[in-house]
């Protein structure tokens, strides 16, 4: 039985050209997290964090995606095209799969100044 819950940063906004941290946290379960996958709105894979082999950044994103902090993901050099949904998928044993959703809105610099959480200065 799956007892865990995923907490995410929810809806966030960040400046064009800036960086933002996407964070998910799995709680209320003793299941072993074997892997966390990060996907973009079109279901393309951004990165994998495997418990045994570590981080793997999809080659197409290696210049704009940085691992961490923790199981989170840092997106850099944001463009307006980065606006959209992001998903964290926790693969666990024995529970199975948990999935969280974050919506990122990339704003022109002047609009975004006071609205981003988890944003890197």
């Amino acid at each position: 039985m799956m007892t865990g819950t995923i907490e995410t940063t929810g809806n966030i906004s960040a400046k064009k050209g800036g960086s933002v941290i996407l964070q998910c946290h799995l709680s209320s379960t003793m299941a072993q997290v074997t892997q966390v996958n990060w996907e973009q709105h079109d279901h393309s894979l951004l990165a994998i964090r495997n418990a045994e082999l570590g981080w793997h950044i999809y080659p197409a994103f290696k210049d704009r995606v940085a691992p961490g902090p923790g199981l989170g993901l840092t997106l850099q050099s944001l463009t307006m095209n980065d606006t959209g949904e992001y998903f964290c998928t926790y693969h666990t044993y024995p529970d199975g799969t948990y999935r969280g959703r974050i919506f990122l809105e990339v704003l022109e610099s002047s609009v975004a100044e006071h609205s981003a959480r988890f944003q890197i200065p």
């Epitope: 074997t34 892997q35 996958n37 996907e39 279901h43 393309s44 894979l45 994998i48 495997n50 045994e52 082999l53 570590g54 793997h56 950044i57 999809y58 080659p59 290696k62 693969h91 799969t97």
Partner: antibody, heavy 121, light 108 residues
């Protein structure tokens, strides 16, 4: 050219261990993951595990954890797969196969010729 | 683990005809899917990776498509050397990386 050459066929008794070698040539050994896949007679392909030859990190299928050990010798560009506590169901052809670069998992693009392991009393 | 299901288990096709093989993943693997060909007594050979990219030296009659959970391998005009067993495999979640059960393409 890129190739993987495996050790010869083995016949083992139940309870014994077997160690199969796989020597790589024609590419930079440390830069690519190595996988082990087995195939029982008349059956499909079964993934056993993976090793990062650069740093020795491994990840094993849960089914084999505690019985399988994958190691490497960078000086000879050779990986090894040892399976212990053998039983008749372990009778199979064992393949090593090169995966993607260690920055991304990738498909299995180069395969060894296979090593037949027969477990019989 | 991600379960890969191939269909049909056996496909009977005449030489020169088109063959369409299916592979379904129990959850999204994005485009991280490969197809392999295996002939009796031989090691598998990589045909397609990234769901649709042909591996080096693979003839153009082999093509892959799909994304997410549904994938297809098409052999446009079967040659005698194409009769073999074909496996799909996901390489996005591990352990374990998982293979489908295989589709045997036989001569009709």
């Amino acid at each position: 050219q890129v190739q993987l050459v495996q050790s010869g066929a083995e016949v083992k008794k139940p309870g014994a261990s077997v160690k199969v070698s796989c020597k790589a040539s024609g590419y930079t050994f440390r830069e690519y993951y190595m996988h082990w896949v087995r195939q029982a007679p008349g059956q499909g392909l079964e993934w056993m595990g993976i090793i990062n030859p650069s740093i020795g990190l491994t990840s094993y299928a849960r089914k084999f954890q505690g019985r399988v050990t994958m190691t490497r010798d960078t000086s000879t560009s050779t990986v090894y797969m040892e399976l212990s506590s053998l039983r008749s169901e372990d009778t199979a052809v064992y393949y090593c196969a090169r995966g993607g670069r260690t920055t991304w998992i990738g498909a299995l693009d180069i395969w060894g010729q296979g090593t037949m392991v027969t477990v019989s009393s | 683990e991600i379960v890969m299901t191939q269909s049909p288990a056996t496909l009977s096709v005449s030489p020169g005809e088109r063959a369409t093989l299916s592979c379904r993943a129990s959850q999204s693997v994005s485009s991280n899917l490969a197809w392999y060909q295996q002939k009796p007594g031989q090691a598998p050979r990589l045909l397609i990776y990234g769901a649709s990219t042909r591996a080096t030296g693979i003839p153009a009659r082999f093509s892959g498509s799909g994304s997410g959970t549904e994938f297809t391998l098409t052999i446009s005009s079967l040659q005698s050397e194409d009769f073999a067993v074909y496996y799909c495999q996901q390489y996005v979640v591990w352990p374990p990386l998982t293979f489908g059960g295989g589709t045997k393409v036989e001569i009709k």
